[in-house]
Interface confidence: medium
């Protein structure tokens, strides 16, 4: 009798109520391997989930996240809201920027604050997790008639290297 069931292909189940005949999986269910005694219920992509791949008789549905969210966990088991300013997306989800770095966007990565001294300037406004520092004139430039604060230099590529 076991051998009869092993002949049932994916997309069917071995129906004990019908002398172990291979019956097709009912709607909204699937069997991805042969010889199954039951079909599994299809995953439903609802709420923050959206369907990436429809369920078929032989494979489960695959879900993705709606706009404004990203997948976390195996098989997109969770949807996490997109990161806020002051955070960056990593493999472990949204993480706050560390001291000395910032991200002023909802996407993207934390970048180091501009080093004002490299341009011979001083820090006019301190940086935060969400904002770069603002560089101002160097002390030597603070003589009468000197120009006011300059906009920050473009953010440099972060040193991602874990130390």
């Amino acid at each position: 009798l076991q051998d009869l069931c092993s002949n049932c292909p994916a997309g069917t189940f071995c129906d004990n109520n019908r002398s172990q005949i291979c019956s097709p999986c009912p709607p909204n269910s699937f069997s991805s391997a042969g010889g199954q005694r039951t079909c599994d219920i299809c995953r439903q992509c609802k709420g923050v989930f959206k369907t990436r791949k429809e369920c078929s008789s032989t494979s489960n549905a695959e879900c993705d996240c709606i706009s404004g969210y990203h997948c976390l966990g195996a098989e997109c088991s969770m949807c996490e809201q997109d990161c806020k300013q002051g955070q960056e997306l990593t493999k472990k989800g949204c993480k706050d920027c560390c001291f000395g770095t910032f991200n002023d966007q909802k996407r993207g990565i934390c970048r180091p604050w501009t080093n004002c001294s490299l341009d011979g300037k001083s820090v006019l406004v301190n940086g935060t997790k969400e904002r770069d520092v603002v560089c101002g004139p160097s002390p030597a430039d603070l003589s009468p008639g000197a120009s006011s604060a300059t906009p920050p230099a473009p953010a440099r590529e972060p040193g991602h290297s874990p130390q």
């Epitope: 695959e62 976390l72 195996a74 493999k91 472990k92 706050d96 920027c97 770095t101 990565i109 290297s161």
Partner: antibody, heavy 125, light 111 residues
Framework: EVQLVESGGGLVQPGGSLRLSCAAS?????????MCWVRQAPGKGLEWIGC????????YYASWAKGRFTISRDNSKNTVYLQMNSLRAEDTAVYYC?????????????????WGQGTLVTVSS | IQMTQSPSSLSASVGDRVTITCQSS????????LAWYQQKPGKAPKLLIY???NLASGVPSRFSGSGSGTDFTLTISSLQPEDFATYYC????????????FGTGTKVTVL
């Protein structure tokens, strides 16, 4: 200096086994990013083998590598290993160790910012 | 997961604008977890671009990346002698688990 150095490559007979090592210096494995293995057959492209999370030890493998290839780590030695079993002629390649870039907070970012020089594995009788 | 680069090879001259495309069979994680690498013979790959469009440290600004989801482009605005090499895209994916894949490669040679 931050670097990765692979060792353990060489000539091995079909069906044999080999363990490659990747020693890291200039940084330590106490974070949640991955150390990975990538190979390149002569004249061919790059092929991802698998990775190990240096924090919790989770492993991820390419479907073709599961079963024959095993990645492990020894955080105290700052070393990652690639155990290769039942080797075949088509496994002949340069094997690279690569570090996944980490975020400012120490978490994996999905791309490789540091590579070793590679070690050649030749499978032949 | 298949990552197909085109062309597989191209010949160009110094000063040319070069464009390489990378197409993935499924979307990379968060639609932008895509990197580009340069590899020269006998050497390990070198990171050029990460997160689809961010220039890695020390990489000249003539390199740029764009794209989202499954379709990405690497552009070299003005090819220099040191740029003759093979280029690979690399995607990061989250399906049943984390998964990485490399493109088929594009070899850039002197015309």
């Amino acid at each position: 200096e931050v670097q990765l150095v692979e060792s353990g490559g060489g000539l091995v007979q079909p069906g044999g086994s080999l363990r490659l090592s990747c020693a890291a210096s200039g940084f330590s494995f106490n974070n949640d990013y991955d150390m990975c293995w990538v190979r390149q057959a002569p004249g061919k492209g790059l092929e991802w083998i698998g990775c190990i999370d240096t924090g919790d030890g989770s492993t991820y493998y390419a479907s073709w590598a599961k079963g024959r290839f095993t990645i492990s780590r020894d955080n105290s030695k700052n070393t990652v290993y690639l155990q290769m079993n039942s080797l075949r002629a088509e496994d002949t390649a340069v094997y690279y160790c690569a570090r996944e870039a980490a975020s400012s907070s120490g978490y994996g970012m999905g791309y490789f910012d540091l590579w070793g020089q590679g070690t050649l594995v030749t499978v032949s009788s | 997961i298949q990552m197909t680069q085109s062309p597989s090879s191209l010949s160009a001259s110094v000063g040319d604008r070069v464009t390489i495309t990378c197409q993935s069979s499924q979307s990379v994680y968060d639609n932008n977890w895509l990197a580009w690498y340069q590899q020269k013979p006998g050497k390990a790959p070198k990171l050029l671009i990460y997160r689809a469009s961010n220039l890695a440290s020390g990489v000249p600004s003539r390199f740029s990346g764009s794209g989202s989801g499954t379709d990405f482009t690497l552009t070299i605005s003005s090819l220099q002698p040191e740029d003759f090499a093979t280029y690979y895209c690399q995607g990061t994916y989250l399906s049943s688990n984390w998964y990485w894949a490399f493109g088929t490669g594009t070899k850039v040679t002197v015309l």
